[in-house]
Interface confidence: medium
Amino acid sequence: MMTGTIETTGNISAEKGGSIILQCHLSSTTAQVTQVNWEQQDQLLAICNADLGWHISPSFKDRVAPGPGLGLTLQSLTVNDTGEYFCIYHTYPDGTYTGRIFLEVLESSVAEHGARFQIP
């Protein structure tokens, strides 16, 4: 039975040209995390595998940085980066948990960050 829950940064906003950290928490389960996939709508951004480490998709390697932790840093943000992002936790023995983050990239110089996790 899947007992875990994913907590995410939720709905967040950031300035065009800036950077943002996407982070998720998996809690309430003793399952082992074997891999975390980060996806933007239907595109794979990055994978962090427990044994093989990080892989950044070639088309994003100039604008995506691993971490902190199992999070993902998006850099040089454009308005086109606005949209849904998903953290997909592959676990054993529970299976797959998915968290959703909505990022809005603003032209304005005033971009409010939501939730607990913020880029310093």
Epitope: S27, D51, W54, G67, P68, T73
Partner: antibody, heavy 119, light 110 residues
Framework: EVQLLESGGGLVQPGGSLRLSCAAS????????MSWVRQAPGKGLEWVSG???????YYADSVKGRFTISRDNSKNTLYLQMNSLRAEDTAVYYC?????????????WGQGTTVTVSS | QSGLTQPPSASGTPGQRVTISCSGD????????VSWYQQLPGTAPKLLIY???QRPSGVPDRFSGSKSATSASLAISGLQSEDEADYYC???????????FGGGTKLTVL
């Protein structure tokens, strides 16, 4: 060979400032997370500050507002500017490189530079 | 104040197996990978285990790491006198937005 060499430590009075440097060689400096870790005499390791490859900076609560981490990728050098120093900042300061695989294990350490804050 | 808890000391006799624990919470060990460091007297720390259980090249297979939920462990089998050192666990803490180390465990080989 991957190497880190710290410098800039010394004796300083409370309230004073110091700038530590860490010269890196043997790897592509700009591609790695870098950190400063300190160890007070007879105590354990305490992470002080880190700089991500995106240039985002992170600090331990104990040094926030007083210390500033920075890097010069053209010189392969990491810095720690320490202001408003206190007696409790007395420690050996190590520069450490993030691990290539999972980024946050620190796989290379310098030999450390000693900072003594005393009047 | 450390977000990771280690026993202050551990001991064993040559040839024995000893285990050092490192406990955290959902903001650090739960969602991030744990690494372990060995610090011999008077020297800089050395990476022993990364990614919960991976060994860097050159680290003997007598050293092994594991993690379950919010607790991680370092096991040393076939204990040798040169293993006498301080051992630290470490990981990223998502809430603090900072790296955290355990308080360290002093291993004595009797």
């Amino acid at each position: 060979e991957v190497q880190l060499l710290e410098s800039g430590g010394g004796l300083v009075q409370p309230g004073g400032s110091l700038r530590l440097s860490c010269a890196a060689s043997g790897f592509t400096f700009s591609s790695y997370w870098m950190s400063w870790v300190r160890q007070a005499p007879g105590k354990g390791l305490e992470w002080v500050s880190g700089i991500h490859i995106s240039d985002s900076t992170y600090y331990a609560d104990s040094v926030k507002g007083r210390f500033t981490i920075s890097r010069d990728n053209s010189k392969n050098t990491l810095y720690l500017q320490m202001n408003s120093l206190r007696a409790e900042d007395t420690a050996v300061y190590y520069c450490a490189k993030g691990h290539t695989v999972l980024q946050y294990g620190m796989d290379v350490w310098g030999q450390g530079t000693t900072v003594t804050v005393s009047s | 104040q450390s977000g990771l808890t280690q026993p202050p000391s551990a001991s064993g006799t040559p040839g024995q197996r000893v285990t050092i624990s490192c406990s955290g919470d959902i903001s650090n060990t739960r969602n991030n990978y744990v690494s372990w460091y060995q610090q011999l007297p008077g020297t800089a720390p050395k990476l022993l285990i990364y990614g919960n259980h991976q060994r860097p090249s050159g680290v003997p297979d007598r050293f092994s790491g594991s993690k379950s939920a919010t607790s991680a462990s370092l096991a040393i089998s076939g204990l040798q006198s040169e293993d006498e050192a301080d051992y630290y666990c470490g990981t990223w803490d998502n809430t603090l937005n900072a790296w955290v180390f355990g308080g360290g465990t002093k291993l004595t080989v009797l």
